[in-house]
């Protein structure tokens, strides 16, 4: 699987999950989240050659098409597969609230 | 929706489904499919700015991150959303077989 266990410990050039730290204020302009100040969101990056963790029959077709037509702009793209929630603290008035923001952290990628 | 109805009739620059015809022999090297000789597979292409048909909370975060950090390589990608099957005819010996190949045609796209 193109997950953090594999991707963070390798020098994989193809589609893989990469490390990305996002600071809520600096990178998003969000001041409403009190904690955490930022988080390891990660992101997906890398080419999607034929047979590399392809998502659907269409992805396989498109990767093969791209192999036969190297100059084409049609190619599969490396995108998130497994996402995890992030617990946050924000304030309603003076009262702190804890909430889980769903689908915030990328754990693995796929070629779609 | 970023579907064929909207995208094929507009000059949309952002993520949208684009026309792509794939010839099984020429583009994939497949000789086993007897009919059709090719099909309109389509593909997804275009930038994914903030709020443009974003798939998950993570996609929104990444698009906003990209807006604040324009030079970053982390950005959402335009990928298939709705896929449709393609009926094909192939031969087993001298006997023609009809089969539906699932997830072969892109009908709409999303930013993931």
């Amino acid at each position: 699987a193109l997950d953090t266990n594999y991707c963070f410990s390798s020098t994989e050039k193809n589609c893989c999950v990469r490390q990305l730290y996002i600071d809520f204020r600096k990178d998003l302009g969000w001041k409403w989240i009190h904690e955490p100040k930022g988080y390891h969101a990660n992101f997906c990056l890398g080419p999607c050659p034929y047979i590399w963790s392809l998502d659907t029959q269409y992805s396989k077709v498109l990767a093969l098409y791209n192999q036969h037509n190297p100059g084409a702009s049609a190619a599969p793209c490396c995108v998130p597969q497994a996402l995890e929630p992030l617990p946050i603290v924000y304030y309603v008035g003076r009262k702190p609230k804890v909430e889980q923001l769903s689908n915030m952290i990328v754990r693995s990628c796929k070629c779609s | 929706a970023l579907d064929t109805n909207y995208c094929f009739s507009s000059t949309e620059k952002n993520c949208c489904v684009r026309q792509l015809y794939i010839d099984f022999r020429k583009d994939l090297g497949w000789k086993w499919i007897h009919e059709p000789k090719g099909y309109h597979a389509n593909f997804c292409l275009g930038p994914c700015p903030y709020i443009w048909s974003l798939d998950t909370q993570y996609s929104k975060v990444l698009a906003l991150y990209n807006q604040h950090n324009p030079g970053a390589s982390a950005a959402p990608c335009c990928v298939p959303q709705a896929l449709e099957p393609l009926p094909i005819v192939y031969y087993v010996g001298r006997k023609p077989k009809v089969e539906q190949l699932s997830n072969m045609i892109v009908r709409s796209c999303k930013c993931s």
Epitope: D23, K26, E35, K37, G38, H40, P87, P96, V98 | -
Partner: antibody, heavy 117, light 107 residues
């Protein structure tokens, strides 16, 4: 590399005020929270508060509200902490520390404050 | 405010031994916890952040674990340079309180 250089030791009289500085270098000062921490001789660490230099936002430990005032000067990449109405209880070492990734990853060398008549 | 209860307060051990220091939070802090080492007269040094991640340059004999309200710092095969004081600190809503500290002494 990241460095936090604090001002020198201070000897002040009870009732007076003092302003401690922390000059940052090696990172984007404006976009990282700066924390301040107190340590009395032979004791543990106490979190005083934090400031976001980019817009001057602050969060204080309730215990230090009215005692400590945090400010920052973006042009010189310097954070300040003013302590007022000093008593012997304020005699301590004060640290500035950069907030990053759910921790304080870089600390200043500490400023010793002695309050004595 | 979230309280951090650190134990033991002091520990007398020999070089080569393994020690575990624990920190209990008064409520769930979702792994937003750091561990520091402080030598006499020096600034604290970050060892572990986000409960389990080793800070740059920290030897692999140090490890952090835990979740929810219970966290621990383990030091395998103690070296002479490991003696000093250790503190945990939560980062789950201000004030970011510290544990009371653990003084690690040579036996």
């Amino acid at each position: 590399q990241v460095q936090l250089q604090q001002s020198g030791a201070e000897l002040v009289k009870p009732g007076a005020s003092v302003k401690i500085s922390c000059k940052a270098s090696g990172y984007a000062f404006s976009s990282s929270w700066m924390n301040w921490v107190k340590q009395r001789p032979g004791k543990g660490l106490e979190w005083i508060g934090q400031i976001y230099p980019g817009d001057g936002d602050t969060n204080y430990n309730g215990k230090f509200k009215g005692k400590a005032t945090l400010t920052a000067d973006k042009s010189s990449s310097t954070a300040y902490m003013q302590l007022s109405s000093l008593t012997s209880e304020d005699s301590a070492v004060y640290f500035c520390a950069r907030h990053y990734d759910g921790s304080t990853d870089y600390w200043g060398q500490g400023t010793t404050l002695t309050v004595s008549s | 405010d979230i309280q951090m209860t650190q134990s033991p307060a002091s520990l007398s051990v020999s070089v080569g031994e393994t020690v575990t220091i624990t920190c209990r939070a008064s409520e769930n802090i979702y792994s937003n916890l750091a561990w520091y080492q402080q030598k006499q007269g020096k600034s604290p040094q970050l060892l572990v952040y986000a409960a389990t991640n080793l800070a740059d340059g920290v030897p692999s004999r140090f490890s952090g674990s835990g979740s929810g309200t219970q966290y621990s710092l383990k030091i395998n095969s103690l070296q002479s340079e490991d003696f000093g004081s250790y503190y945990c600190q939560h980062f789950w809503g201000t004030p970011y309180t510290f544990g009371g500290g653990t003084k690690l002494e040579i036996k």
